[in-house]
């Protein structure tokens, strides 16, 4: 019989229910914004905003300082007081909409939903390894601001994204705000603007450049700004907005907006549609060509990538890539495919596509019917004409006006749908060694740290653990401080090591020592841990073999048994070739001689499942006793594998040596032509791996085998005669003298 070891699912080598406790801070209210600061002299801080309060934490997440940012009109509001005697506007709570660092000063800038969305600047004061906030400066000059023109009105209650860029001695705030008719009518925030911070920090310089959704579209056309970042010569905003000004406003898609970071101008404002799809390897009938679209961006982060992912994306190591988590719609509800997909857009490629789009619009030959787009910001026009004009005048350049690039940038899910039901709500990507890791927060309050790699059909987890017991969604914004990431969930901020929270979720030595080097995992006798967790027995260089099962569970005391051992860490080499003298198997007192691997039986094992098999021939010693005993596998002197060498012993109970006994055979005669159904009765007749009933030396074909009974069909007889009948188990004869009589047919 050809018995095969059962597959062990890959998931059995890890346990994602292992509890990890990471440092946390309770903010006393829903966390609205968070940003980190690392100074030149080893000082660092975490700034956490909740309604009406701004917390300053040390690198250990202990509170250093707390500032009242509201309610507006309340005498205790410390930021409001910086604007001098009030009233400055209607009283009300302050929800922090913007929390950014101005690295030039350095200073923290916070802008809230109260006081017309004005901002406050807090200089940073290092105190040892901690940082304190200096008193806030009110970035608002009353005499410069009117409801219809307010350079100091920055934050929209509907959401604002800000990226600060240093140009010369000045700080420029690249601001993108969500608007509706009501917000637009109140102190006129703009959709996209570039504002210069005045040198004396009394506000922003008037006369700034801006784009805004035109009044006629404000009711139906809303733009959500999901993320903003600065890399190279540009600032980028990522938006979710209606695909068309004229069609169904609920049909959304994702765009990237690009602005110059070197010139505070909006003439070279460009937009590009980002298209992310799930394209399963085997397309279902009726599934869309090119994959299922996931048009709505949920979270995004840009980061340089490691060597492996760079190769897969056909870019150079260390190049910046924009990663986005996309869902099928605003509610992110279940569709046919996974709930969340992750797409990667190399920044250089984005820029090339944008530049090519500008060429198409502005260079001869003119493509007829090519629209400039952005009709929600500007008057409609065809390329190469400026907005609202029929033709280019000699002194205007086609390139000096905002443009929507006519082609989109399409990518497919890096994870091949493997995120399945997981709803990702936060994303931060880091490069560790040559590995690119996505650190993801989820709707149910978990952190997934997964290697970003395209070519696999399973996820390579660094970790997958629950942040706490609340199960509240992890919030969109993630910050890095040293070797840690800060995630917010509910009213808590959690500090998660980028190397993962620990190693205890790896259950086997092999899985433990195959973990990424940066995780610092080692084997501690019977668990996976970091060196500080078990200094005594911690090691990273070898694993003992692990027996999980064997077959058969019994064998004859006399005669041989072909024993198949199942488990892991037998070989470390896919071929399963065993160097001479490295593997020693004993069953009880008896040796089991290793058998060469039958190459015809080698079958590819997908990494998602794993099992190793080892076969040996068991010949019991004369001194071996009947009864239960252990199977022991000892591996020594094995050459090291890629991650570790195999060394040690594994013992498994449950093998029994038995003595087969033949009690009865019937019938004792049959026709010479053969085919008589013989029944042999006895005990322990099924032990071992081989048995044979011989009638006059010729095998009687076994039809059924059980512990107490064998059925076989007699072979044809040469003549009418009484012939010897014997039973062999494991090649050894079972005691007893039996005959079978061939008669005439």
């Amino acid at each position: 019989e050809d018995w095969q070891c059962p597959r062990t699912p890959y998931a059995a080598s890890r346990d994602f229910d292992v509890k990890y406790v990471v440092p946390s801070f309770s903010a006393g209210g829903l966390v609205q914004a968070m940003v980190t600061y690392e100074g030149d002299r080893n000082e660092s801080a975490v700034f956490v905003a909740i309604r009406n309060r701004l917390h300053v934490l040390g690198p250990d997440l202990k509170s250093v300082q707390s500032l009242a940012t509201g309610p507006a009109g309340d005498p205790g509001c410390q930021t409001c007081a910086a604007c001098g005697p009030g009233p400055h506007g209607p009283p009300g709570d302050t929800d922090t909409k913007v929390l950014v660092l101005d690295p030039a000063l350095p200073a923290l800038v916070s802008c809230g939903s109260s006081l017309q969305g004005r901002c406050f600047l807090h200089d940073l004061e290092p105190q040892g390894t901690a940082v304190h906030l200096a008193a806030p400066a009110c970035l608002f000059s009353a005499h410069h601001n009117r409801p219809d023109d307010c350079p100091d009105c920055v934050a929209s209650p509907l959401g604002t994204r800000v990226t600060v860029v240093e140009q010369g001695q000045a700080s420029y705030f690249y601001v993108a705000s969500s608007l509706d008719a009501a917000v637009a009518a109140s102190f006129s925030p703009r959709s996209v603007s570039i504002r210069r911070l005045k040198a004396d920090a009394s506000g922003f310089a008037p006369g700034f450049v801006a784009l805004s959704v035109l009044p006629k579209h404000l009711v139906s056309y809303s733009i959500e700004y999901v993320h903003s970042f600065h890399t190279g010569a540009f600032v980028y905003f990522l938006t979710v907005q209606p695909a068309s000004v004229t069609d169904d406003p609920s049909a959304l898609h994702t765009r990237l907006a690009r602005l110059s970071a070197t010139e505070p101008e909006l003439g070279d404002y460009r937009e590009l549609v980002l298209d992310c799809r799930f394209a399963p390897k085997r397309r279902r009938r009726g599934a869309p060509e090119g994959g299922q679209p996931y048009p709505v961006l949920r979270v995004a982060h840009s980061a340089p990538v490691g060597a492996q992912l760079a190769t897969e994306l056909s870019i150079a190591e260390g190049q910046e890539v924009l990663f986005g988590v996309f869902v099928t719609g605003k509610d992110g509800g279940p569709g046919v495919g996974p709930n969340s997909v992750v797409c990667a857009f190399p920044i250089d490629l984005l820029d090339t596509l944008i530049d090519e789009g500008v060429e198409r619009c502005c260079e001869s030959p003119v493509h007829p019917g090519l629209r400039r787009g952005l009709d929600f910001f500007q008057s409609p026009s065809f390329c190469p004409n400026p907005p609202g004009l029929e033709a280019l005048s000699p002194n205007t350049s086609c390139r000096h006006f905002p443009l929507l690039v006519s082609s989109s940038f399409s990518r497919v899910d890096l994870f091949n749908g493997l995120l399945g039901p997981v709803q990702v709500t936060a994303l931060y990507v880091t490069r560790l060694d040559n590995v690119t890791v996505a650190h993801m927060g989820t709707m149910d309050g978990r952190i997934l740290q997964v290697e970003l790699v395209r070519s696999l059909n399973y996820l390579l987890y660094v970790s997958n653990f629950s942040l706490g017991d609340s199960g509240q969604p992890v919030q969109r914004d993630v910050s890095r401080l040293g070797d840690h990431l800060l995630f917010a969930s509910g009213d808590q901020v959690f500090q998660v090591p980028i190397q993962g929270p620990g190693c205890r979720h790896f259950l086997t030595c092999g899985r433990c020592l195959r973990a990424w080097h940066f995780m610092g995992c080692g084997w501690c006798g019977n668990m996976c841990g970091q060196q500080k967790e078990c200094p005594g027995s911690w090691q990273q260089d070898h694993c003992p073999p692990k027996l999980t099962e064997f077959h058969p569970h019994s064998g004859p005391l006399r005669g041989s048994t072909r024993l198949t051992l199942c488990g892991s860490n037998f070989y470390l080499h896919p071929s399963g070739l065993v160097p001479e003298g490295t593997h020693q198997v004993t069953v009880g007192q008896s040796p089991c001689r290793p058998l060469p691997k039958d190459s015809s039986k080698l079958r590819p094992v997908p990494r998602k499942d794993f099992v190793e098999e080892f076969e040996c021939e068991l010949e019991p010693l004369g001194t071996q006793a009947v009864g239960p005993t252990n199977v022991s596998l000892t591996v020594t002197n094995m050459p090291p594998g890629k991650h570790f060498r195999v060394d040690g012993t594994s013992v498994l109970r449950g093998f029994s040596f038995m003595e087969p006994v033949l009690i009865a055979v019937q019938p004792l005669f049959g026709p010479r032509a053969g085919g008589t159904c013989l029944t042999l009765e006895g005990q322990s007749l099924s032990v071992g791996t081989s048995r044979a009933v011989l009638v006059n030396g010729t095998e009687c074909l076994l039809a059924r085998v059980s512990e107490g009974q064998l059925l076989c069909a007699t072979p044809p007889g040469a003549t009418v005669a009484s012939v010897p009948l014997s039973l062999q188990v494991g090649g050894a004869q079972v005691p007893g003298s039996w005959t079978f009589q061939y008669r005439e047919d």
Epitope: A134, A135, A199, A201
Partner: antibody, heavy 121, light 107 residues
């Protein structure tokens, strides 16, 4: 380390003039508002004048505006106070002071040791 | 002009005690108030600005509080080196104005 060193004080007759100087070092002078503050013998402090980094914004205490002129030379890291038509009540120690950072309008964080002006006949 | 009144001309205290110095503004100055310490023959030193923010390097036994028109400088656990004149100054309106000062002396 921030250092402000005043000079130019001395004895002057009523109606006379003096020009006080303040040499700054240890910080980016061109980014800070600077002030003059005086203290009459045995009395409290009195703010005199201030000037913004690019000399475009200048403020005085109203009673001194006609007689005193504040100026600065960022290239030389220097602050000046030109005092004309001096009176006996202008007798005081004159301090040069730097504003707290670049944006807290009138809070001073660094002061010179002062230079004494005596107006007497 | 905004008048700042420091009603206590002299406050007597002992080492280790807790003492408060007050300053009252003739009109609302928000939190735009600074406290200075001046020892005889020396120039003033900034202690607290924006009413409650301790200037860097100032010991944490100095605490500022108040907003609007009423402000207090509190020194807990007074040390002998704290004996000096204390001035408040508002910077909410021009001209910038100072209080007349409060002298802290040993009983």
């Amino acid at each position: 380390e921030v250092q402000l060193v005043e000079s130019g004080g001395g004895l002057v007759q009523p109606g006379g003039s003096l020009r006080l100087s303040c040499a700054a070092s240890g910080f980016d002078f061109s980014r800070h508002w600077m002030s003059w503050v005086r203290q009459a013998p045995g009395k409290g402090l009195e703010w005199v004048s201030e000037i913004n980094p690019d000399s475009r914004t200048i403020n005085y205490t109203p009673s001194l505006k006609e007689r005193f002129t504040i100026s600065r030379d960022n290239a030389k890291n220097s602050l000046y106070l030109q005092m004309n038509s001096l009176r006996a009540e202008d007798t005081a120690v004159y301090y040069c002071a730097r504003r707290v950072r670049i944006h807290y309008y009138g809070a001073m964080d660094s002061w010179g040791q002062g230079t004494t002006v005596t107006v007497s006949s | 002009d905004i008048v700042l009144t420091q009603s206590q001309k002299i406050v007597s205290t002992s080492v280790g005690a807790r003492v408060s110095v007050t300053c009252k503004a003739s009109q609302n100055v928000g939190s735009s108030l600074v406290w200075y310490q001046q020892k005889p023959g020396q120039s003033p030193k900034t202690l607290i600005y924006s009413a409650s923010f301790r200037y860097s390097g100032v010991p944490d036994r100095f605490t500022g509080s108040g907003s609007g028109t009423d402000f207090t400088l509190t020194i807990s656990n007074v040390q002998s080196e704290d004996l000096a004149d204390y001035f408040c100054q508002q910077y909410n309106n021009y001209p910038l104005t100072f209080g007349a000062g409060t002298k802290l002396e040993l009983k």
